[in-house]
Amino acid sequence: EEELQVIQPDKSVSVAAGESAILHCTVTSLIPVGPIQWFRGAGPARELIYNQKEGHFPRVTTVSESTKRENMDFSISISNITPADAGTYYCVKFRKGSPDTEFKSGAGTELSVRGKPSAPVVSGPAARATPQHTVSFTCESHGFSPRDITLKWFKNGNELSDFQTNVDPVGESVSYSIHSTAKVVLTREDVHSQVICEVAHVTLQGDPLRGTANLSETIRVPPTLEVTQQPVRAENQVNVTCQVRKFYPQRLQLTWLENGNVSRTETASTVTENKDGTYNWMSWLLVNVSAHRDDVKLTCQVEHDGQPAVSKSHDLKVSA
């Protein structure tokens, strides 16, 4: 009689996370009598996965009915595979005894787990920046395997080229993470812009994952001010308007000063929105000319989004 061989026909098996892995093993003889055990890894630290003789292995089922006469198929199925299950699995024949002793091992089957990357998370700078400044965005995705992955950056559908990407760890691992930083130059038109991080991986079947960041969270467009004097509305009254244009975000406070003294403070409320997403607002001040002997310096002072105030002045002539 030929000596028993343990045959593991698959050198490697690749399974998507969450699925079941079937690990094939057959023996070529009924002799010697004794159980089959499955291990992950080799040597003294190997991990018992299944023991035909005894134990409780809730995730493992035998593929064939191992109690049936002349059964030589000891393939197993492991359910709900996770990246932590990756490794080399050995089917080992034991010889009956007290205790049973290891008789022969199969060559092993390497199980690799295809882990889907997590949804990319894009984060921008902590503080807002103004047009013409360069800001950095980061994109992170975790838990994927194998290591090969493609990451692209887009701004409004246009691919970006100024970015750096790292995949960790560098060596072998059950799963990997990707981290990328892209540099984006802001323009005044970016309130409605989006930055997109796109991740492509073998587990996604050609359907990449995307993470987005709205530049509206990042950009600050400072206002332009224009102070104008309107025709006299009534005797001794002049209407002065302050046009606050093209600002973003909306948070804005305006103060009128007459000769340096605070006349009125108000917060932007009824704004109008421009096509590019910025806002316009107008404030007006009625000045009683008869109350002034000399010329009046009117100043429109605007504090936008917590930034230092900007102002525009207008000299109101008081005729004798």
Epitope: N51, S66, R69, E70
Partner: antibody
Framework: QVQLVQSGAEVKKPGASVKVSCKAS????????INWVRQAPGQGLEWIAM????????HYNQIFKDRATLTTDTSTSTAYMELRSLRSDDTAVYYC????????????WGRGTLVTVSS | DIVLTQSPDSLAVSLGERATINCRAS??????????IFWYQQKPGQPPKLLIY???NRDSGVPDRFSGSGSGTDFTLTISSLQAEDVAVYYC????????FGQGTKLEIK
């Protein structure tokens, strides 16, 4: 280690039934066949039947097919052999035995249960 | 049904001598490349103990003075050098179909 612990001796009257138990330990009960064998005083071994606890598949010796019933309780890893319509020539030691190689052989044996049938 | 007939019914052998027990099947017990014959030893007051499986393979812990041979219908259990502790009744069993036992051979010391 594998152990098969059988229930105690029984004395039964002719026509009665007996149910012998065999509690298994030291191995996964559902992974191996259990055989039942009897031995009348001073006589040889006689195979009665076998059961696969994983699915309750049974095979019976034709001689016992109408009188013997094998069952298992997987929650307690216990096998049972019930023999009905007892006669005096059913007096014997009844053994359970575990088949470790699925070869329809008997690798590990219980110590036996003496069933005496007497009026 | 396959019937197994053992011979002799009883046997007396001197210590250190060879003991041979035969088992003949009423039809071949060979199937799938294996001879489905098993040998058991039973000492008084004890359950049987498996000695040989599939005609020629010693079970674990069985001394190597015990050996099994044969094919098809004729099988032999040999004890190469009889020891006092080998006094017992020996049974063959087949499982080519559903199991049956031979009638047993009583081995004593001469």
């Amino acid at each position: 280690q594998v152990q098969l612990v059988q229930s105690g001796a029984e004395v039964k009257k002719p026509g009665a039934s007996v149910k012998v138990s065999c509690k298994a330990s030291g191995y996964t009960f559902t992974n191996y066949w259990i055989n039942w064998v009897r031995q009348a005083p001073g006589q040889g071994l006689e195979w009665i039947a076998m059961i696969d606890p994983s699915d309750s598949e049974t095979h019976y010796n034709q001689i016992f097919k109408d009188r013997a019933t094998l069952t298992t309780d997987t929650s307690t890893s216990t096998a049972y052999m019930e023999l009905r319509s007892l006669r005096s020539d059913d007096t014997a030691v009844y053994y359970c035995a575990m088949d470790y190689g699925s070869l329809y052989a008997m690798d590990y044996w219980g110590r036996g249960t003496l069933v005496t049938v007497s009026s | 049904d396959i019937v197994l007939t053992q011979s002799p019914d009883s046997l007396a052998v001197s210590l250190g001598e060879r003991a041979t027990i035969n088992c003949r099947a009423s039809q071949s017990v060979r199937s799938s490349g294996y001879n489905w014959i098993f040998w058991y030893q039973q000492k008084p007051g004890q359950p049987p103990k498996l000695l040989i499986y599939l005609a020629s393979n010693r079970d674990s812990g069985v001394p190597d003075r015990f050996s099994g041979s044969g094919s098809g219908t004729d099988f032999t259990l040999t004890i190469s050098s009889l020891q006092a502790e080998d006094v017992a009744v020996y049974y063959c069993q087949h499982s080519r179909e559903l199991p049956t036992f031979g009638q047993g051979t009583k081995l004593e010391i001469k």
